[in-house]
């Protein structure tokens, strides 16, 4: 009978929303496959000391360190971390294993260090050592992919110089426009670095690692498509590679393609051609213009000409530094309570921006869409008609941009009242900002029509709650009104609201809402 290793150490990485964290089950249901930490007997150590592979954890990640003891019967255990003993509750599974777990929720610097686990089984004692550190994501990078021609082959290599090593995939689509959205059935993904099929309509390369995903589209001029109303523009930074693909389809092979920069033919070695027959026996030709590392003098109009198609051009602009061009002046909007409305920012940027929309200290995902004129647009519609300040923030490697929006929702005032021994105050958040009146209710004026003008102090927009203005009015108490009911009314173009207050003794006062439209 040959012996199996008694101790198995595993790491379970929990997804952030994982409800199974900290729960035990007969055969633990885990959010992701447990990673074997290869617990090995420590050489030159007295007794049975096992050492697990070092564990690197992202800040705020949740993990479970787990030890499986393949030994029959009961075990007892103790965790020690930074000289403190931690409670240890083994459970036993259906595979006859003792299972000991240490859950670390939302990893922080203070939770990094050496975790020692002492296990006593019916037969032997074991010591298991885990070393947990925080992954240094400061060294992480995710760079936009770029293209290179494969040596001696008509193929493109996609490169992303990122840390950790990214997964590179080609995203191909053969239809037009909207149907080439990421999750469309027309989109084909190939998880490889080299692409040989370069005739497709839309070709992108994406790289992804722990920091996210970055994509680069192969800039294409299609001579069979009607040219855009504005000249397509391609921005590049000095030193970056330039790739433009010119594509044309014709009934037979009797046509040729050429590239010119500012009416001068491109030099040999700066272009290569490929051709193929399509399913309906028409000929597809593509001609690539490329410069491995652009300089300022590569700026200009690149024109693709064909003996059988009208020529088309693109303006290539080489910049020293990235940019974000947009108007940053703040914008105020006033809408009705059920009116459909979206904030939008139109910008031109290179490299592509990362952006967020923020409201009330909460960030929302930001989508951007390219327009035909070289501009992009980002819209935000998810405001749920909450008035206040909305912020659009965009950045790329070289530039930052912030734009403020204020949203006002037209609605009739709602009044809240409070009173103290010396004064009564009313507050309202209606828009447009309301005006105030105070009225005294007495025997002479049972309908509270007697207006109070003395001792009234109005503060318009004195309190900003996430950009939402609040108006208030305060009435200083005088002997003339003590013991009476008073009514404060806020009114704007959409209606009036009132609140009645009894001015008698200090303390909280009951008040009756009295809505008048």
């Amino acid at each position: 009978n040959q012996d199996l290793p008694v101790i198995k150490c595993v790491l379970i990485n929990h997804k952030n929303n994982d409800s199974s964290v900290g729960k035990s089950s007969s055969y633990p249901m885990v959010s992701e496959s447990p990673e074997d930490l290869g617990c090995a007997l420590r050489p030159q150590s007295s007794g049975t000391v096992y050492e697990a592979a070092a564990v690197e954890v992202d800040v705020s990640a949740s993990i479970t360190l787990q030890v499986l003891v393949d030994a029959p019967g009961n075990i007892s255990c103790l965790w020690v971390f930074k000289h403190s003993s931690l409670n240890c509750q083994p459970h036993f599974d259906l595979q006859n294993r003792g299972v000991v777990s240490m859950v670390i929720l939302k990893m922080t610097e203070t939770q990094a260090g050496e975790y020692l686990l002492f296990i006593q089984s019916e037969a032997t004692n074991y010591t298991i050592l885990f070393t947990v550190s925080i992954r240094n994501t400061l060294l992480y990078t995710l760079r936009r992919p770029y293209f290179r021609k494969m040596e001696n082959q008509d193929a493109l290599v996609c490169i992303s110089e990122s840390v950790p090593e990214p997964i590179v995939e080609w995203v191909l689509c053969d239809s037009q426009g909207e149907s080439c959205k990421e999750e469309s059935p027309a989109v084909v993904k190939k998880e490889e670095k080299v692409l040989h099929e370069l005739f497709g309509t839309d070709i992108r390369c994406c790289a992804r690692n722990e920091l996210g995903r970055e994509c680069t589209r192969l800039f294409t001029i299609d001579l069979n498509q009607t040219p855009q109303t504005t000249l397509p523009q391609l921005f590049l930074k000095v030193g970056e590679p330039l790739w433009i693909r010119c594509k044309a389809v014709h009934v037979n092979h009797g046509f040729g393609l050429t590239w010119e920069l500012e009416n001068k033919a491109l030099e040999e070695g700066n272009y290569f051609e490929m051709s193929t027959y399509s399913t309906n026996r028409t000929m597809i030709r593509i001609l690539f213009a490329f410069v491995s590392s652009v300089a300022r003098n590569d700026t200009g109009y690149y024109t693709c000409s064909s003996s059988k198609h009208p020529s088309q051009s693109a303006l290539v602009t080489i910049v020293e530094k990235g940019f974000i061009n947009a108007t940053n002046s703040s914008e105020d909007y006033e809408i009705d309570q059920y009116e459909e409305f979206c904030f939008s920012v139109r910008f031109k940027a290179y490299p592509q921006i990362r952006c967020t929309w923020t409201f009330s200290r909460k960030s929302f995902p930001c989508e951007q869409k390219g327009l035909d004129n070289g501009y992009s647009i980002s819209k935000f519609c998810n405001h749920k008609h909450q008035p206040g300040e909305y912020i659009f923030h965009a950045e790329n490697d070289d530039a930052q941009f912030t734009k403020m929006f204020t949203l006002n929702i037209r609605r009739k005032p709602q009044v809240l009242a409070e009173a103290s021994a010396s004064q009564a105050s009313c507050f309202s958040d209606g828009y447009p900002l309301p005006s105030w009146t105070w009225k005294k209710c007495s025997d002479k004026s049972p309908n509270c029509t007697e207006e109070i003008t003395e001792g009234v102090w109005n503060r318009k927009a004195n309190r900003k709650v996430f950009g939402q203005w609040v108006s208030s009015s305060t009435l200083n108490m005088s002997e003339a009104i003590k013991g009476f009911l008073v009514k404060c009314c806020a009114y704007n173009s959409l209606g009036t609201s009132c609140e009645t207050i009894l001015l008698n003794s200090p303390g909280p006062f009951p008040f009756i809402q009295d809505n008048i439209s």
Epitope: D3, Y27, D70, G73, N74, L94, E122
Partner: antibody, heavy 118, light 109 residues
Amino acid sequence: EVQLVQSGGGLVQPGGSLRLSCAASGFTFSSYAMSWVRQAPGKGLEWVSGISWNSGSIGYADSVKGRFTISRDNAKNSLYLQMNSLRAEDTALYYCAKVGGGGAFDIWGQGTMVTVSS
Amino acid sequence: QSVLTQPPSVSAAPGQKVTISCSGSSSSIGDNYVSWYQQVPGTAPKLLIYGNNKRPSGIPDRLSGSKSGTSATLGITGLQTGDEADYYCGTWDNSLGGVFGGGTKLTVL
């Protein structure tokens, strides 16, 4: 000699109940997880239920969940399977098995036949 | 439908070598040990291999087991007529509990 001796099988009508027993000897029963495995006539093996040595972990196959209950009595070296709401598809030869190293079933009972038929 | 996939049958002449494959998933074979069982018709299953490649005492070294990723293999060399039986692979699944293959009938020609 290490062995598992089963009893309690028989013929039962659909909707009926039956309790299977498995008596262990020759090893420290209270230190090992145990399982029930069944085999329908002419078919393969199907794991039915399992229980850890201290009854702290219990598991069932989806096909029997809510109808079968596994239990053990370490003082009596015995494993049990209470089967309720029996169906025709529960007809099988039921084996009790000891769980050994690597989670393998290293000792098997002789099997007991359960026939569910009207 | 078994969680683990085995070929329904294999055959070889006496003295030959035969292999039986068993494929599963990352949550079954990928994360757990594989065991192999022999069942002669009319008898209870018998453990042949545990822990992917270990033999219990009394099991000859003609039998071997291996595991790679989410697949496992049982090998029998020097086939004998007494090896004719049904062979099952088994393991545990992180969410299903115990799981078996559908069984492979070994015929010695």
